[in-house]
Interface confidence: low
């Protein structure tokens, strides 16, 4: 079988066989290498020479295959929108960025720009679990049976109640989504009837 | 003063369907976040039997999921209960629940439900 052409070859219908490795010079209508992440070109390809490619300068970075003349500035992540750095900035990757904890991305293009606040989940709810932090908002959810929550808190989980058997106690109270179940010595005169009133 | 009447309750045969009312005066429910339905048996604990927030978001124990729906009128000032397919381990006294913490927690009187043929 006839050997592949390396770059540079000829290319008469604009493509090249390696889309993500090669790409199309138009004007010597050949197909030239593209620089590895963490280079650029430092010099263009002709008929006769394929690309040269030089390492990105610190404090500079190229994340794909490029044909590209200069690297990308790395960046800071900005603390007054609120992201924080969770991966240094390498000559390969951009500096990786991560909303503050206790808050999520509310501006996005293409990566997060402006983190806010997180909601508070009111008494009664808790924050519903997502598959990755940072990424939206609080979506509070009621507590499920036999649980509780008595804050205002974006991060606060719903609680068991308390079994007052497992004391050796009796149940005064029973426990509601916000409270905790009342419990007391089995000993003591039984409340008031709680229908209709209202319990501190 | 907060008050919470119950209506609805009644005889039902199994299979059955009931529709629960809690009624509110003395406060717009919109001011409470969770509003909840609660049952006692005879000889048992009270036990929650559906909750909803502000959103309208529910949940339910394992026990009466798929089966009973809470939902909130906050126009009417009013909370539902709608149950169905009803079994005889549903009777039990119902009570409407309101949470207001830090205040306190509000309760109805209780309305009667008897499922039985």
């Known amino acids: 079988s006839q050997p592949q052409a390396v770059p540079p070859y000829a290319s008469e219908n604009q493509t090249c066989r390696d889309q993500e490795k090669e790409y199309y010079e138009p004007q010597h209508r050949i197909c030239c290498s593209r620089c590895p992440p963490g280079t650029y070109v430092s010099a263009k390809c002709s008929r006769i020479r394929d690309t040269v490619c030089a390492t990105c300068a610190e404090n500079s970075y190229n994340e794909h295959w490029n044909y590209l003349t200069i690297c990308q500035l790395c960046r800071p992540c900005d603390p007054v929108m609120g992201l924080e750095e969770i991966a240094p900035c390498t000559s390969k990757r951009k500096t990786q960025c991560r909303c503050q904890p206790g808050m999520f991305c509310a501006a996005w293009a293409l990566e997060c720009t402006h983190c806010e606040l997180l909601s508070d989940c009111p008494p009664g709810t808790e924050a519903e679990l997502k598959d990755e932090v940072g990424k939206g908002n609080n979506h509070c959810v009621p507590c499920k049976a036999g649980h509780f929550q008595n804050t205002s808190s974006p991060s606060a989980r719903c609680q068991p109640h308390t079994r007052c058997e497992n004391q050796g106690l009796v149940e005064a109270a029973p426990g509601t989504a916000q409270s905790d179940t009342t419990c007391k010595n089995p000993l003591e005169p039984l409340p008031p009837e709680m229908s209709g009133t209202m319990l501190m | 003063e907060v008050q919470l009447v119950e209506s609805g309750g009644g005889l039902v045969q199994p299979g059955g369907s009931l529709r629960l009312s809690c009624a509110a005066s003395g406060s717009s429910i919109f001011s409470f976040e969770i509003m909840a339905w609660y049952r006692q048996a005879p000889g048992k604990q009270r036990e929650l039997v559906a909750v909803?927030?502000?959103?309208?978001?529910?949940n339910y124990p394992d026990s009466v999921e798929g089966r009973f729906t809470i939902s909130r009128d906050n126009a009417k000032n009013t909370v539902y209960l709608q149950m169905n397919s009803l079994r005889p381990e549903d009777t039990a006294v119902y009570y409407c629940n309101a949470d207001a913490v830090p205040h306190g927690s509000y309760w109805g009187q209780g309305t009667l439900v008897t499922v039985s043929s």
């Open positions: 909803i927030n502000k959103g309208g978001e529910a």
